[in-house]
Protein backbone atom coordinates (compact mmCIF):
# COMPACT_ATOMS: atom_id res chain seq x y z
CA UNK A 1 0.00 0.00 0.00
CA UNK A 2 2.86 2.36 0.91
CA UNK A 3 4.54 1.57 -2.41
CA UNK A 4 1.37 2.48 -4.34
CA UNK A 5 1.05 5.73 -2.37
CA UNK A 6 4.71 6.61 -2.93
CA UNK A 7 4.42 5.87 -6.63
CA UNK A 8 1.15 7.76 -7.00
CA UNK A 9 2.45 10.75 -5.07
CA UNK A 10 5.66 10.72 -7.10
CA UNK A 11 3.62 10.77 -10.28
CA UNK A 12 1.40 13.67 -9.12
CA UNK A 13 4.37 15.71 -7.85
CA UNK A 14 6.22 15.13 -11.14
CA UNK A 15 3.11 16.04 -13.11
CA UNK A 16 2.82 19.35 -11.25
CA UNK A 17 6.55 19.92 -11.71
CA UNK A 18 6.50 19.30 -15.45
CA UNK A 19 3.42 21.53 -15.86
CA UNK A 20 5.43 24.19 -14.01
CA UNK A 21 8.48 23.68 -16.26
CA UNK A 22 6.26 24.09 -19.34
CA UNK A 23 4.67 27.20 -17.80
CA UNK A 24 8.07 28.69 -16.92
CA UNK A 25 9.41 28.03 -20.43
CA UNK A 26 6.43 29.79 -22.00
CA UNK A 27 6.37 32.72 -19.57
CA UNK A 28 7.57 36.14 -20.70
CA UNK A 29 8.85 37.22 -17.31
CA UNK A 30 12.23 35.54 -17.09
CA UNK A 31 13.84 38.89 -16.49
CA UNK A 32 12.03 42.02 -15.42
CA UNK A 33 13.16 45.61 -15.35
CA UNK A 34 14.81 46.55 -12.08
CA UNK A 35 12.80 49.45 -10.71
CA UNK A 36 15.06 50.12 -7.71
CA UNK A 37 16.96 52.88 -9.47
CA UNK A 38 13.98 54.25 -11.41
CA UNK A 39 10.79 53.40 -9.50
CA UNK A 40 8.83 56.11 -11.32
CA UNK A 41 9.22 54.73 -14.81
CA UNK A 42 5.97 54.66 -16.76
CA UNK A 43 7.29 51.96 -19.06
CA UNK A 44 8.00 48.46 -17.75
CA UNK A 45 10.23 46.04 -19.66
CA UNK A 46 10.37 42.30 -19.25
CA UNK A 47 11.86 39.46 -21.27
CA UNK A 48 11.28 35.78 -21.80
CA UNK A 49 13.08 33.01 -23.66
CA UNK A 50 11.09 33.66 -26.82
CA UNK A 51 10.19 37.35 -26.81
CA UNK A 52 10.61 40.65 -25.02
CA UNK A 53 7.73 42.82 -23.90
CA UNK A 54 7.06 46.41 -22.93
CA UNK A 55 4.08 47.34 -20.80
CA UNK A 56 3.14 50.98 -20.85
CA UNK A 57 1.27 52.56 -17.99
CA UNK A 58 -1.75 52.83 -20.28
CA UNK A 59 -2.04 49.06 -20.04
CA UNK A 60 -0.88 48.67 -23.63
CA UNK A 61 1.58 45.78 -23.88
CA UNK A 62 3.74 45.23 -26.92
CA UNK A 63 5.70 42.01 -27.32
CA UNK A 64 8.31 41.28 -29.97
CA UNK A 65 9.55 37.79 -30.71
CA UNK A 66 13.23 37.02 -31.17
CA UNK A 67 12.97 36.30 -34.89
CA UNK A 68 16.57 35.20 -35.15
CA UNK A 69 18.57 32.19 -34.10
CA UNK A 70 22.10 33.17 -34.92
CA UNK A 71 21.81 36.63 -33.42
CA UNK A 72 20.84 35.39 -29.96
CA UNK A 73 23.34 34.91 -27.12
CA UNK A 74 24.70 31.37 -26.82
CA UNK A 75 23.62 31.28 -23.17
CA UNK A 76 20.01 31.99 -24.09
CA UNK A 77 20.13 29.21 -26.67
CA UNK A 78 21.56 26.88 -24.03
CA UNK A 79 18.79 27.77 -21.59
CA UNK A 80 16.16 27.16 -24.26
CA UNK A 81 17.74 23.78 -25.05
CA UNK A 82 17.86 22.75 -21.37
CA UNK A 83 14.23 23.68 -20.82
CA UNK A 84 13.07 21.87 -23.95
CA UNK A 85 15.08 18.76 -23.06
CA UNK A 86 13.56 18.94 -19.58
CA UNK A 87 10.03 19.15 -21.00
CA UNK A 88 10.59 16.32 -23.50
CA UNK A 89 12.13 14.00 -20.89
CA UNK A 90 9.41 14.90 -18.42
CA UNK A 91 6.66 14.24 -20.95
CA UNK A 92 8.13 10.84 -21.86
CA UNK A 93 8.59 10.13 -18.16
CA UNK A 94 4.92 10.91 -17.53
CA UNK A 95 3.85 8.66 -20.36
CA UNK A 96 5.98 5.79 -19.05
CA UNK A 97 4.91 6.32 -15.45
CA UNK A 98 1.20 6.19 -16.33
CA UNK A 99 1.69 2.58 -17.50
CA UNK A 100 3.92 1.88 -14.53
CA UNK A 101 1.34 2.93 -11.94
CA UNK A 102 0.46 0.01 -9.68
CA UNK A 103 -3.18 1.06 -9.54
CA UNK A 104 -3.53 0.76 -13.32
CA UNK A 105 -3.76 -2.73 -14.78
CA UNK A 106 -2.73 -3.23 -18.40
CA UNK A 107 -3.29 -6.76 -19.62
CA UNK A 108 -1.01 -9.21 -17.89
CA UNK A 109 1.90 -6.83 -17.27
CA UNK A 110 4.23 -8.27 -14.68
CA UNK A 111 5.22 -6.28 -11.61
CA UNK A 112 8.87 -6.62 -12.57
CA UNK A 113 8.08 -4.71 -15.79
CA UNK A 114 6.20 -2.09 -13.77
CA UNK A 115 9.18 -1.77 -11.47
CA UNK A 116 11.50 -1.20 -14.42
CA UNK A 117 9.15 1.36 -15.93
CA UNK A 118 8.83 3.14 -12.58
CA UNK A 119 12.61 3.33 -12.31
CA UNK A 120 12.90 4.56 -15.91
CA UNK A 121 10.31 7.30 -15.38
CA UNK A 122 11.90 8.21 -12.05
CA UNK A 123 15.30 8.69 -13.70
CA UNK A 124 13.66 10.70 -16.48
CA UNK A 125 11.96 12.95 -13.94
CA UNK A 126 15.23 13.47 -12.08
CA UNK A 127 17.06 14.41 -15.28
CA UNK A 128 14.12 16.59 -16.36
CA UNK A 129 14.14 18.43 -13.03
CA UNK A 130 17.91 18.88 -13.18
CA UNK A 131 17.64 20.27 -16.73
CA UNK A 132 15.05 22.81 -15.61
CA UNK A 133 17.03 23.82 -12.52
CA UNK A 134 20.20 24.08 -14.60
CA UNK A 135 18.46 26.15 -17.28
CA UNK A 136 16.95 28.56 -14.80
CA UNK A 137 20.22 28.82 -12.87
CA UNK A 138 22.24 29.55 -16.01
CA UNK A 139 19.77 32.33 -16.89
CA UNK A 140 19.88 33.69 -13.34
CA UNK A 141 23.67 33.73 -13.43
CA UNK A 142 23.54 35.56 -16.76
CA UNK A 143 21.21 38.15 -15.19
CA UNK A 144 23.42 38.66 -12.16
CA UNK A 145 26.50 39.15 -14.36
CA UNK A 146 24.70 41.64 -16.61
CA UNK A 147 23.17 43.42 -13.62
CA UNK A 148 26.51 44.23 -12.08
CA UNK A 149 28.04 45.07 -15.43
CA UNK A 150 25.25 47.58 -16.13
CA UNK A 151 25.57 48.94 -12.58
CA UNK A 152 29.23 49.66 -13.20
CA UNK A 153 28.39 51.98 -16.08
CA UNK A 154 24.93 52.95 -14.92
CA UNK A 155 25.07 56.57 -15.96
CA UNK A 156 26.71 57.91 -19.06
CA UNK A 157 26.55 61.68 -19.12
CA UNK A 158 27.31 64.57 -21.41
CA UNK A 159 29.21 66.98 -19.23
CA UNK A 160 27.24 65.79 -16.23
CA UNK A 161 24.15 67.50 -17.59
CA UNK A 162 22.23 64.73 -19.30
CA UNK A 163 21.55 61.40 -17.66
CA UNK A 164 21.04 58.25 -19.68
CA UNK A 165 19.76 55.48 -17.44
CA UNK A 166 20.66 52.02 -18.66
CA UNK A 167 17.85 49.51 -18.10
CA UNK A 168 18.86 46.85 -15.61
CA UNK A 169 17.08 43.52 -15.37
CA UNK A 170 16.43 41.39 -12.33
CA UNK A 171 14.88 37.97 -11.65
CA UNK A 172 11.44 37.50 -13.14
CA UNK A 173 8.60 35.30 -11.90
CA UNK A 174 9.47 32.56 -14.41
CA UNK A 175 12.77 31.89 -12.67
CA UNK A 176 11.05 31.10 -9.38
CA UNK A 177 8.40 29.02 -11.15
CA UNK A 178 11.20 27.15 -12.92
CA UNK A 179 13.19 26.49 -9.76
CA UNK A 180 10.16 25.25 -7.84
CA UNK A 181 8.91 23.18 -10.79
CA UNK A 182 12.35 21.67 -11.36
CA UNK A 183 12.58 20.83 -7.67
CA UNK A 184 9.15 19.21 -7.67
CA UNK A 185 10.01 17.13 -10.75
CA UNK A 186 13.23 16.07 -9.08
CA UNK A 187 11.43 15.08 -5.86
CA UNK A 188 8.79 13.23 -7.89
CA UNK A 189 11.53 11.35 -9.69
CA UNK A 190 13.21 10.35 -6.43
CA UNK A 191 9.85 9.14 -5.10
CA UNK A 192 9.36 7.03 -8.22
CA UNK A 193 12.79 5.48 -7.75
CA UNK A 194 11.99 4.72 -4.11
CA UNK A 195 8.67 3.17 -5.18
CA UNK A 196 10.55 1.04 -7.71
CA UNK A 197 12.52 -0.62 -4.94
CA UNK A 198 9.26 -1.65 -3.31
CA UNK A 199 7.91 -2.98 -6.58
CA UNK A 200 10.98 -5.08 -7.44
CA UNK A 201 10.37 -8.87 -7.33
CA UNK A 202 11.75 -10.59 -4.24
CA UNK A 203 12.20 -14.35 -4.76
CA UNK A 204 11.73 -15.50 -1.13
CA UNK A 205 11.65 -19.30 -0.90
CA UNK A 206 10.49 -20.96 2.32
CA UNK A 207 13.00 -23.36 3.83
CA UNK A 208 11.98 -26.83 4.99
CA UNK A 209 8.68 -26.59 6.78
CA UNK A 210 7.33 -29.70 8.45
CA UNK A 211 3.68 -30.28 9.16
CA UNK A 212 3.08 -32.95 11.76
CA UNK A 213 -0.22 -34.54 10.90
CA UNK A 214 -1.66 -37.19 13.18
CA UNK A 215 -0.66 -40.60 12.02
CA UNK A 216 1.43 -39.48 9.06
CA UNK A 217 4.64 -37.52 8.92
CA UNK A 218 4.82 -35.61 5.69
CA UNK A 219 7.76 -33.35 5.01
CA UNK A 220 7.67 -30.81 2.20
CA UNK A 221 10.96 -30.50 0.42
CA UNK A 222 12.59 -27.07 0.09
CA UNK A 223 11.69 -25.27 -3.07
CA UNK A 224 8.43 -27.03 -3.41
CA UNK A 225 6.42 -23.93 -2.45
CA UNK A 226 6.85 -20.33 -3.36
CA UNK A 227 5.71 -17.60 -1.05
CA UNK A 228 2.71 -15.83 -2.43
CA UNK A 229 3.98 -12.36 -1.78
CA UNK A 230 2.38 -11.00 -4.84
CA UNK A 231 5.79 -10.39 -6.48
CA UNK A 232 6.74 -13.95 -7.44
CA UNK A 233 7.07 -15.00 -11.06
CA UNK A 234 4.19 -17.42 -10.60
CA UNK A 235 1.76 -14.84 -9.32
CA UNK A 236 0.15 -14.38 -12.69
CA UNK A 237 -2.57 -16.82 -11.81
CA UNK A 238 -2.13 -16.77 -8.04
CA UNK A 239 -3.19 -13.23 -7.07
CA UNK A 240 -3.27 -13.20 -3.29
CA UNK A 241 -3.56 -9.42 -2.86
CA UNK A 242 -4.68 -6.98 -5.44
CA UNK A 243 -3.18 -3.69 -4.30
CA UNK A 244 -5.11 -1.41 -6.60
CA UNK A 245 -8.81 -1.78 -6.05
CA UNK A 246 -9.54 -0.20 -9.41
CA UNK A 247 -8.98 3.36 -8.23
CA UNK A 248 -8.53 5.32 -11.39
CA UNK A 249 -6.51 8.43 -10.67
CA UNK A 250 -7.89 10.94 -13.12
CA UNK A 251 -4.96 13.30 -13.09
CA UNK A 252 -5.54 16.34 -15.21
CA UNK A 253 -2.78 18.57 -16.43
CA UNK A 254 -4.04 22.11 -16.25
CA UNK A 255 -2.46 24.14 -19.01
CA UNK A 256 -1.06 27.38 -17.66
CA UNK A 257 -2.80 30.27 -19.38
CA UNK A 258 -0.76 33.41 -19.82
CA UNK A 259 -2.65 36.63 -20.32
CA UNK A 260 -0.65 38.52 -22.86
CA UNK A 261 -2.62 41.77 -22.74
Amino acid sequence: MAVTACQGLGFVVSLIGIAGIIAATCMDQWSTQDLYNNPVTAVFNYQGLWRSCVRESSGFTECRGYFTLLGLPAMLQAVRALMIVGIVLGAIGLLVSIFALKCIRIGSMEDSAKANMTLTSGIMFIVSGLCAIAGVSVFANMLVTNFWMSTANMYTGMGGMVQTVQTRYTFGAALFVGWVAGGLTLIGGVMMCIACRGLAPEETNYKAVSYHASGHSVAYKPGGFKASTGFGSNTKNKKIYDGGARTEDEVQSYPSKHDYV
Epitope: V40, T41, A42, V162
Partner: antibody, heavy 119, light 113 residues
Framework: QVQLVQSGAEVKKPGASVKVSCKAS????????MHWVRQAPGQGLEWIGM????????NYNEKFKSRVTMTVDTSTSTAYMELSSLRSEDTAVYYC????????????WGQGTTVTVSS | DIQMTQSPSSLSASVGDRVTMTCKSS????????????LTWYQQKPGKAPKLLIY???TRESGVPSRFSGSGSGTDFTLTISSLQPEDFATYYC?????????FGGGTKLEIK
Protein backbone atom coordinates in the same frame (compact mmCIF):
# COMPACT_ATOMS: atom_id res chain seq x y z
CA GLN B 1 -17.85 59.66 -30.58
CA VAL B 2 -15.66 60.05 -27.49
CA GLN B 3 -16.68 62.96 -25.29
CA LEU B 4 -15.44 64.23 -21.94
CA VAL B 5 -17.76 66.81 -20.40
CA GLN B 6 -16.48 68.68 -17.36
CA SER B 7 -18.36 70.55 -14.63
CA GLY B 8 -18.71 74.32 -14.65
CA ALA B 9 -16.39 77.03 -13.37
CA GLU B 10 -15.76 77.32 -9.64
CA VAL B 11 -14.75 80.21 -7.39
CA LYS B 12 -13.24 79.17 -4.07
CA LYS B 13 -11.70 80.81 -1.06
CA PRO B 14 -8.13 79.92 0.06
CA GLY B 15 -8.10 76.83 2.27
CA ALA B 16 -11.29 75.43 0.75
CA SER B 17 -11.65 72.35 -1.48
CA VAL B 18 -12.87 71.96 -5.02
CA LYS B 19 -14.25 68.85 -6.72
CA VAL B 20 -14.21 68.83 -10.50
CA SER B 21 -16.18 66.18 -12.40
CA CYS B 22 -15.60 64.71 -15.84
CA LYS B 23 -18.38 62.69 -17.48
CA ALA B 24 -17.21 60.29 -20.18
CA SER B 25 -19.21 58.91 -23.09
CA UNK B 26 -18.61 57.17 -26.40
CA UNK B 27 -16.18 54.55 -25.11
CA UNK B 28 -15.75 51.92 -22.42
CA UNK B 29 -15.05 54.09 -19.41
CA UNK B 30 -13.38 51.35 -17.35
CA UNK B 31 -10.80 50.51 -20.04
CA UNK B 32 -8.78 53.72 -20.06
CA UNK B 33 -6.77 55.74 -17.62
CA MET B 34 -8.14 59.19 -16.87
CA HIS B 35 -5.58 61.94 -16.48
CA TRP B 36 -5.91 65.31 -14.86
CA VAL B 37 -3.82 68.21 -16.16
CA ARG B 38 -3.96 71.87 -15.19
CA GLN B 39 -2.91 75.11 -16.81
CA ALA B 40 -2.43 78.33 -14.85
CA PRO B 41 -3.28 81.57 -16.72
CA GLY B 42 -0.63 82.27 -19.35
CA GLN B 43 1.39 79.28 -18.16
CA GLY B 44 2.24 75.83 -19.45
CA LEU B 45 0.63 72.46 -18.75
CA GLU B 46 1.12 70.57 -15.47
CA TRP B 47 0.25 66.92 -14.92
CA ILE B 48 -1.64 66.28 -11.67
CA GLY B 49 -2.14 62.54 -11.82
CA MET B 50 -4.23 59.71 -13.22
CA UNK B 51 -6.75 57.09 -12.16
CA UNK B 52 -7.80 53.77 -13.67
CA UNK B 53 -11.61 53.49 -13.42
CA UNK B 54 -11.58 49.69 -13.42
CA UNK B 55 -9.21 49.12 -10.52
CA UNK B 56 -9.38 52.53 -8.89
CA UNK B 57 -5.59 52.61 -8.81
CA UNK B 58 -4.08 56.07 -8.89
CA ASN B 59 -0.77 57.70 -9.67
CA TYR B 60 -0.31 61.23 -8.40
CA ASN B 61 2.30 63.85 -9.08
CA GLU B 62 4.32 64.09 -5.85
CA LYS B 63 3.69 67.84 -5.83
CA PHE B 64 -0.07 67.31 -5.33
CA LYS B 65 -0.05 63.99 -3.46
CA SER B 66 -1.02 65.42 -0.08
CA ARG B 67 -3.87 67.53 -1.47
CA VAL B 68 -5.40 65.64 -4.37
CA THR B 69 -7.94 62.80 -4.41
CA MET B 70 -9.09 61.15 -7.62
CA THR B 71 -12.18 58.97 -7.66
CA VAL B 72 -14.56 57.44 -10.18
CA ASP B 73 -18.21 56.48 -10.34
CA THR B 74 -18.42 53.69 -12.89
CA SER B 75 -22.22 53.64 -12.81
CA THR B 76 -22.31 57.14 -14.30
CA SER B 77 -18.93 56.95 -16.12
CA THR B 78 -17.74 59.97 -14.22
CA ALA B 79 -14.27 60.78 -12.91
CA TYR B 80 -13.70 63.24 -10.07
CA MET B 81 -10.68 65.22 -8.99
CA GLU B 82 -10.74 66.90 -5.60
CA LEU B 83 -8.08 69.40 -4.61
CA SER B 84 -7.99 70.53 -1.00
CA SER B 85 -6.26 73.36 0.92
CA LEU B 86 -6.59 75.65 -2.08
CA ARG B 87 -4.13 78.49 -2.58
CA SER B 88 -4.17 81.39 -5.01
CA GLU B 89 -1.59 79.62 -7.19
CA ASP B 90 -4.12 76.80 -7.74
CA THR B 91 -6.10 79.20 -9.95
CA ALA B 92 -6.06 77.39 -13.29
CA VAL B 93 -8.01 75.57 -15.94
CA TYR B 94 -8.30 71.90 -14.97
CA TYR B 95 -8.55 69.34 -17.76
CA CYS B 96 -9.45 65.68 -17.68
CA UNK B 97 -7.95 63.60 -20.48
CA UNK B 98 -8.49 60.02 -21.58
CA UNK B 99 -5.52 57.67 -21.72
CA UNK B 100 -4.55 56.76 -25.25
CA UNK B 101 -4.39 52.97 -25.59
CA UNK B 102 -1.63 52.67 -28.18
CA UNK B 103 0.74 54.86 -26.22
CA UNK B 104 1.00 56.76 -23.03
CA UNK B 105 -0.44 60.03 -24.32
CA UNK B 106 -3.97 61.23 -23.58
CA UNK B 107 -5.88 61.58 -26.84
CA UNK B 108 -9.22 63.05 -25.76
CA TRP B 109 -9.54 66.05 -23.49
CA GLY B 110 -12.39 67.67 -21.64
CA GLN B 111 -13.26 71.29 -22.36
CA GLY B 112 -11.65 72.38 -19.11
CA THR B 113 -12.96 73.69 -15.79
CA THR B 114 -11.80 77.09 -14.58
CA VAL B 115 -11.10 77.16 -10.86
CA THR B 116 -10.47 80.57 -9.33
CA VAL B 117 -9.06 80.82 -5.83
CA SER B 118 -9.60 84.25 -4.41
CA SER B 119 -10.22 85.74 -0.99
CA ASP C 1 11.57 64.75 -12.17
CA ILE C 2 12.56 65.02 -15.82
CA GLN C 3 12.93 68.62 -16.97
CA MET C 4 11.69 69.46 -20.45
CA THR C 5 13.17 72.52 -22.17
CA GLN C 6 11.63 73.88 -25.35
CA SER C 7 13.21 76.36 -27.70
CA PRO C 8 12.52 78.87 -28.98
CA SER C 9 9.81 80.05 -26.57
CA SER C 10 8.21 82.01 -29.41
CA LEU C 11 8.58 81.91 -33.14
CA SER C 12 7.30 84.11 -35.98
CA ALA C 13 6.73 82.60 -39.40
CA SER C 14 4.63 83.01 -42.52
CA VAL C 15 2.17 80.69 -44.23
CA GLY C 16 4.08 78.19 -46.37
CA ASP C 17 7.25 78.37 -44.26
CA ARG C 18 9.06 75.35 -42.94
CA VAL C 19 9.23 75.57 -39.15
CA THR C 20 11.31 73.60 -36.69
CA MET C 21 11.11 73.66 -32.90
CA THR C 22 13.16 71.66 -30.43
CA CYS C 23 12.63 69.95 -27.11
CA LYS C 24 15.38 68.79 -24.76
CA SER C 25 14.91 66.44 -21.82
CA SER C 26 17.16 66.22 -18.76
CA UNK C 27 17.10 62.42 -18.99
CA UNK C 28 16.90 60.03 -21.92
CA UNK C 29 13.37 59.15 -22.99
CA UNK C 30 14.55 56.17 -25.01
CA UNK C 31 13.32 52.85 -23.72
CA UNK C 32 15.85 50.12 -24.46
CA UNK C 33 13.19 47.42 -24.31
CA UNK C 34 11.51 48.48 -27.54
CA UNK C 35 13.81 51.25 -28.77
CA UNK C 36 10.98 53.79 -28.57
CA UNK C 37 11.30 57.36 -27.39
CA UNK C 38 8.51 58.28 -25.02
CA LEU C 39 7.98 61.86 -26.07
CA THR C 40 4.70 63.43 -27.13
CA TRP C 41 3.90 66.67 -28.96
CA TYR C 42 0.70 68.65 -28.39
CA GLN C 43 -0.84 71.63 -30.13
CA GLN C 44 -2.91 74.09 -28.12
CA LYS C 45 -4.94 76.99 -29.41
CA PRO C 46 -6.10 79.82 -27.09
CA GLY C 47 -9.05 78.82 -24.92
CA LYS C 48 -8.95 75.25 -26.17
CA ALA C 49 -7.74 71.94 -24.76
CA PRO C 50 -4.44 70.55 -26.06
CA LYS C 51 -4.57 68.26 -29.09
CA LEU C 52 -2.32 65.24 -29.51
CA LEU C 53 -0.13 65.50 -32.61
CA ILE C 54 2.72 63.02 -32.25
CA TYR C 55 3.57 60.24 -29.81
CA UNK C 56 6.60 57.95 -29.49
CA UNK C 57 8.58 60.97 -30.77
CA UNK C 58 7.72 60.32 -34.42
CA THR C 59 4.36 58.54 -34.72
CA ARG C 60 1.61 60.81 -36.03
CA GLU C 61 -1.77 60.54 -34.35
CA SER C 62 -4.53 59.56 -36.78
CA GLY C 63 -6.10 62.57 -38.43
CA VAL C 64 -3.00 64.75 -38.01
CA PRO C 65 -1.82 66.24 -41.35
CA SER C 66 1.37 64.80 -42.85
CA ARG C 67 3.06 68.22 -42.74
CA PHE C 68 3.67 67.57 -39.04
CA SER C 69 6.62 65.33 -38.34
CA GLY C 70 8.58 64.45 -35.23
CA SER C 71 12.14 63.25 -34.94
CA GLY C 72 14.95 62.80 -32.47
CA SER C 73 16.07 60.27 -29.92
CA GLY C 74 17.31 60.07 -26.37
CA THR C 75 17.25 63.64 -25.10
CA ASP C 76 16.94 65.80 -28.22
CA PHE C 77 13.72 66.03 -30.17
CA THR C 78 12.35 68.12 -33.00
CA LEU C 79 8.89 68.98 -34.30
CA THR C 80 8.81 70.12 -37.92
CA ILE C 81 5.95 71.68 -39.85
CA SER C 82 6.90 71.41 -43.50
CA SER C 83 4.55 74.03 -44.88
CA LEU C 84 2.75 76.27 -42.41
CA GLN C 85 -0.99 76.64 -42.76
CA PRO C 86 -3.09 79.40 -41.14
CA GLU C 87 -4.60 76.91 -38.66
CA ASP C 88 -1.14 75.88 -37.42
CA PHE C 89 -0.54 79.10 -35.50
CA ALA C 90 -0.75 77.93 -31.90
CA THR C 91 1.39 76.92 -28.92
CA TYR C 92 3.21 73.58 -29.11
CA TYR C 93 4.15 71.53 -26.05
CA CYS C 94 6.38 68.51 -25.71
CA UNK C 95 5.77 66.04 -22.92
CA UNK C 96 7.86 63.40 -21.16
CA UNK C 97 5.89 60.16 -21.24
CA UNK C 98 8.67 58.00 -19.89
CA UNK C 99 8.79 58.79 -16.22
CA UNK C 100 6.39 59.92 -13.50
CA UNK C 101 5.43 62.64 -13.06
CA UNK C 102 4.74 63.30 -16.73
CA UNK C 103 6.25 66.71 -17.38
CA PHE C 104 5.64 69.26 -20.11
CA GLY C 105 7.96 71.70 -21.77
CA GLY C 106 7.34 75.44 -21.41
CA GLY C 107 5.88 75.57 -24.90
CA THR C 108 6.76 77.22 -28.21
CA LYS C 109 4.34 79.90 -29.35
CA LEU C 110 4.07 80.01 -33.12
CA GLU C 111 2.91 83.42 -34.35
CA ILE C 112 2.13 84.94 -37.74
CA LYS C 113 4.92 87.15 -39.05
Amino acid sequence: QVQLVQSGAEVKKPGASVKVSCKASGYTFTSYWMHWVRQAPGQGLEWIGMIHPNSGSTNYNEKFKSRVTMTVDTSTSTAYMELSSLRSEDTAVYYCARRYYGSISPDYWGQGTTVTVSS
Amino acid sequence: DIQMTQSPSSLSASVGDRVTMTCKSSQSLLNSGNQKNYLTWYQQKPGKAPKLLIYWASTRESGVPSRFSGSGSGTDFTLTISSLQPEDFATYYCQNDYSYPFTFGGGTKLEIK
